[in-house]
């Protein structure tokens, strides 16, 4: 036979040496070059010529080494679905979208297709931090010891309790998961009706 180093070359077992950059063309029983990202097949290969590639037109792309005869149409991020653009479409990459702030991905099909509002975390809790923002709905976890969070919010974080002594004050009432420590001037007694506030 006639061993060849570059496509097109004969393939007896229907596999090609470089699976990423070559493909098996069954009519001619050969391995041919794929087109690089940002291009498409303008003329198919044969035993006598390799694949001919052309650049994707404006507003279209192909992300991978391919043997597609067309480029994919760029699509905008749909704000109605709660998406926003983080990077524009190029010939080599589709528009990069993410969920708008305060939203999470509720429908996933290779990429996020629909975002919904994050659930509120009640007082005394905060949203567990995730590796990737917008990937899932909030999972509320209790504030750890010495911290509080006093609102219903999808994004508020638990804050450390105020340390009265750092301000030259004394503790009038201890902090809870839902409220801060109450401090008072060490010289003044705390009136009974003024709990939960800091007196100067």
């Amino acid at each position: 036979s006639q061993p060849q180093a570059v496509p097109p070359y004969a393939s007896e077992n229907q596999t090609c040496r470089d699976q990423e950059k070559e493909y098996y063309e069954p009519q001619h029983r050969i391995c041919c070059s794929r087109c690089p990202p940002g291009t498409y097949v303008s003329a198919k290969c044969s035993r006598i010529r390799d694949t001919v590639c052309a650049t994707c037109a404006e507003n279209s792309y192909n992300e991978h080494w391919n043997y597609l005869t067309i480029c994919q149409l760029c699509r905008p991020c749909d704000p109605v679905m709660g998406l926003e653009e983080i990077a524009p479409c190029t010939s080599k990459r589709k528009t990069q979208c993410r969920c708008q702030p305060g939203m999470f991905c509720a429908a996933w099909a290779l990429e996020c297709t629909h975002c919904e509002l994050l659930s509120d975390c009640p007082p005394g809790t905060e949203a567990e931090l995730k590796d990737e923002v917008g990937k899932g709905n909030n999972h509320c976890v209790p504030c750890k010891a010495g911290h509080f969070q006093n609102t219903s919010s999808p994004s508020a974080r638990c804050q450390p309790h105020t340390r009265c002594e750092n301000q030259g004050l004394v503790e009038a009432a201890p902090g809870t998961a839902q409220s801060d420590t109450t401090c008072k001037n060490p010289l003044e007694p705390l009136p009974p009706e003024m709990s939960g506030t800091m007196l100067m």
Partner: antibody, heavy 120, light 107 residues
């Protein structure tokens, strides 16, 4: 000994249909791409259809695309050509042909042919 | 489609003669050319493949040469059984196309 024996030819009216068969023997049929070629009376040879070894891929020239269908049954060592919407210009001897399965892609065995006549 | 131009279309020769038939492709077919012999009422038979290689069982008086677009079939010393029609076929690019044939007749 490799043998390819065609059958199913005959006289058919324009617009009619016919199914050709080819019985293969003497080799592992499922290892080979198979073809149909034809030869009109007093004319040269013409490629008609191709089918891959497993039958997944089929190919046709524009002259028969949409009218002819090649198929195979590897369990029965048989090749078929279903012809429909036949025209006078489809009148020819039809040959069942094996393509060698190495790297040179030539046609090493041909059947004796079956005659198809399209006439009113 | 790749056009295959075969010449001559017919040829008269005598037993013992050296005969040459040529095929010209419309573009470089990278030696993906084979030659077939056909006798009346018979199927074609392979003679030469990949432009120059002799098929199994074919007498050595048959030979093929050429590359690119120009190819030749030579019969070095004609025998009585060689009087037939000869076809070239390109199978480098689909659709596969044949030359028009050369009818070799006894002079």
């Amino acid at each position: 000994e490799v043998q390819l024996v065609e059958s199913g030819g005959g006289l058919v009216k324009p617009g009619g249909s016919l199914r050709l068969s080819c019985a293969a023997s003497g080799f592992t049929f499922s290892d080979y791409y198979m073809y149909w070629f034809r030869q009109a009376p007093g004319k040269g040879l013409e490629w008609v259809a191709t089918i891959s070894d497993g039958g997944s891929y089929t190919y046709y020239p524009d002259s028969v695309k949409g009218r002819f269908t090649i198929s195979r049954d590897n369990a029965k060592n048989s090749l078929y050509l279903q012809m429909s919407s036949l025209r006078a210009e489809d009148t020819a001897v039809y040959y069942c042909v094996r393509e060698e399965n190495g790297n040179f892609y030539y046609f090493d065995y041909w059947g004796q042919g079956t005659t198809v006549t399209v006439s009113s | 489609d790749i056009q295959m131009t075969q010449s001559p279309s017919s040829l008269s020769a005598s037993v013992g003669d050296r005969v040459t038939i040529t095929c010209k492709a419309g573009q470089d077919i990278k030696s993906y050319l084979s030659w077939y012999q056909q006798k009346p009422w018979k199927a074609p038979k392979i003679l030469i493949y990949y432009a120059t290689r002799l098929a199994d069982g074919v007498p050595s008086r048959f030979s093929g040469s050429g590359s690119g677009t120009d190819y030749t079939l030579t019969i070095s010393s004609l025998q009585p059984e060689d009087f037939a029609t000869y076809y070239c076929l390109q199978h480098g690019e689909s659709p596969w196309t044949f030359g028009g044939g050369t009818k070799l007749e006894i002079k």
